[in-house]
């Protein structure tokens, strides 16, 4: 299995390889097979990455930053493969690598441009700050700087704040949006153009539900087909907002098909789950169950948030007793 990296062919013996932070990659290089093979990989024409001649590695002059991180495909060298297997790439490894191959027949040099991208799975969070409601799209570690776009009811929003902190390796980005008093649906897209990877967060507010004490409530949560792929691992979490913080009622992991329920009155329909319907029931409502309920369906490529507001009112009996 080849490590995650893809090659873009460009003219003049130069290829572009795109790798992900901390993953392994292959810098490709091939030559016309011949005897007495010599292979030297260099970085930015200065630093010795890997040397092979007389049938074995010679790493005495290897730059320390490459120690224990490089190897060749030794069984393939006689077939003209001088590719370099490169472990755990970092952003500092970005740049131009030159592969020098000498044989009894000829000497060739190939250039490979390594670009490294980072895209730790972003998240969409719903937060209450005093009387304001915010949606926050954030990504803990991303490189290069991503493109973040917001839409309200499928219409792009021009103004969007971006709070950015840069570390040695990458950016950490928060993009908050004030949605106080809005009933619209919102979508946030974060795109890493280098890794050609896009993540989407979608937030939908459902109509408020009024229920009487002791009744049960059914809250819907179905993924939008545009984003949802049942083959992909995902997690579903139902939580309830109480005094500004969410407490988890239940969650479901698609990988293990496990359901964990923290609230005895909560129920999930197994058959509906198998049809990718994560609607839930909350039985025997009491007044303290009033509040906001959040269904979060998340995978590496999306987060779908559905908010329900439930108002539980005293039943007639309870009212007459008072």
């Amino acid at each position: 299995i080849f490590p995650l990296a893809f090659f873009i062919y460009v003219p003049m013996n130069e290829q572009i390889v795109i790798g992900r932070l901390d993953e392994d990659i292959i810098l490709p290089s091939s030559f016309e097979r011949g005897s007495e093979v010599v292979i030297h990989w260099k970085y930015q024409d200065s630093y010795k990455v890997h040397s092979y001649y007389k049938g074995s590695d010679h790493l005495e002059s290897q730059d320390p930053r490459y120690a224990n991180r490089t190897s060749l495909f030794y069984n393939e060298i006689q077939n003209g493969n001088a590719s370099l297997f490169f472990r755990r790439v970092s952003l500092l490894d970005e740049g131009i690598y030159t592969c020098y191959v000498g044989t009894a027949i000829q000497v060739i040099t190939n250039k490979v441009v390594l670009k490294v991208g980072v895209f730790l799975t972003p998240v969409m969070k719903y937060e209450k700050r005093n009387t304001n409601s915010f949606l926050i799209c954030s990504v803990l570690s991303v490189y290069p700087r991503p493109i973040i776009t917001w839409k309200m009811d499928n219409t792009p929003i021009s103004e969007n704040n971006m709070e950015e902190t840069g570390s040695l390796d990458s950016f950490s980005i928060n993009s908050p949006l004030n949605i106080t008093g809005s009933n619209s649906s919102y979508e946030c897209t974060i795109e890493n153009s280098l890794l050609k990877q896009t993540w989407t967060g979608r937030w939908t507010m459902k109509d408020g539900l009024h229920k009487m004490q002791s009744e049960h409530v059914s809250l819907s949560c179905q993924p939008v087909n545009d984003y949802f792929s049942p083959n992909q691992d995902f997690k579903v979490t139902w939580s309830r907002m109480k005094s500004g913080t969410f407490s988890v009622l239940a969650y479901y992991l698609s990988s293990s098909q496990n359901t964990i329920i923290n609230e005895s009155r909560f129920s999930w329909n197994k058959e509906l789950i198998n049809q990718s319907d994560f609607s839930m029931n909350l039985m025997d409502l009491n007044l303290s169950d009033s509040g906001e309920y959040l269904c979060n369906i998340s995978s590496d490529e999306y987060t779908l948030l559905t908010i329900h507001t439930v108002h539980v009112e005293p039943s007639q009996e309870t009212a007459s007793h008072n």
């Epitope: 007495e36 000498g102 044989t103 009894a104 000497v107």
Partner: antibody, heavy 120, light 106 residues
Framework: QVQLVESGGGVVQPGRSLRLSCAAS????????MHWVRQVPGKGLEWVAL????????YYADSVKGRFTISRDDSKNTLFLQMSSLRAEDTAVYSC?????????????WGQGTQVTVSS | DIQMTQSPSTLSASVGDRVTITCRAS??????LAWYQQKPGKAPKLLIY???SLKSGVPSRFSGSGSGTEFTLTISSLQPDDFATYYC????????FGQGTKLEIK
């Protein structure tokens, strides 16, 4: 075709210096390690010095270490040997030699050589 | 340092003869050995590399064999153009030439 032409030889007194040059043509000079090899007429061959294809490493025979310096100018396709503190035993024909590859390989092309005579 | 002992130092032979020149290394050099031919007033010419690989363009009557410490250069049928001095070169650790074998007409 590969051509290596040495120059700069001559008669020099012991203790003095001399700089040999080698003009290379017919190949991509920067892709190959280069060497200097000397031969006393009627006697055997002795390897003198090596410079890697990229100039990053240089090696010398014990007999010349600390006195001779090998260098290259890839933009001019030229190899140099700076010889100082010359001794009578350095008298020889000095040949510029191309290695088949980058360093520590066999020699595949030789120049005709330039005579260096160290004598008072 | 690795010493190379070449024998014989002089070899008299006739056209059509099969001749063998030997090179012995003071320690193992694997197969990192080359053979050169030099004619008076000329630069040495590569014949064999890596003990037994024939350089492109060199006549097939030349062959090399051996590994470790014992190596031979064989000319299967001497031609008039083959009378010259032959040198072995070890390139396993730095470089050392043999003293040379002068091949002359008997």
């Amino acid at each position: 075709q590969v051509q290596l032409v040495e120059s700069g030889g001559g008669v020099v007194q012991p203790g003095r210096s001399l700089r040999l040059s080698c003009a290379a043509s017919g190949f991509t000079f920067s892709n190959y390690a280069m060497h200097w090899v000397r031969q006393v007429p009627g006697k055997g061959l002795e390897w003198v010095a090596l410079i890697w294809y990229d100039g990053s490493e240089k090696y010398y025979a014990d007999s010349v270490k600390g006195r001779f310096t090998i260098s290259r100018d890839d933009s001019k396709n030229t190899l140099f040997l700076q010889m100082s503190s010359l001794r009578a035993e350095d008298t020889a024909v000095y040949s510029c030699v191309r290695e088949y590859s980058s360093g520590w390989g066999y020699f595949d092309y030789w120049g005709q050589g330039t005579q260096v005579t160290v004598s008072s | 340092d690795i010493q190379m002992t070449q024998s014989p130092s002089t070899l008299s032979a006739s056209v059509g003869d099969r001749v063998t020149i030997t090179c012995r290394a003071s320690q193992s050099i694997s197969s990192w050995l080359a053979w050169y031919q030099q004619k008076p007033g000329k630069a040495p010419k590569l014949l064999i590399y890596k003990a037994s690989s024939l350089k492109s363009g060199v006549p097939s009557r030349f062959s090399g064999s051996g590994s470790g410490t014992e190596f031979t250069l064989t000319i299967s049928s001497l031609q008039p153009d083959d009378f010259a001095t032959y040198y072995c070169l070890q390139y396993n650790s730095y470089y050392t030439f043999g003293q040379g074998t002068k091949l002359e007409i008997k």
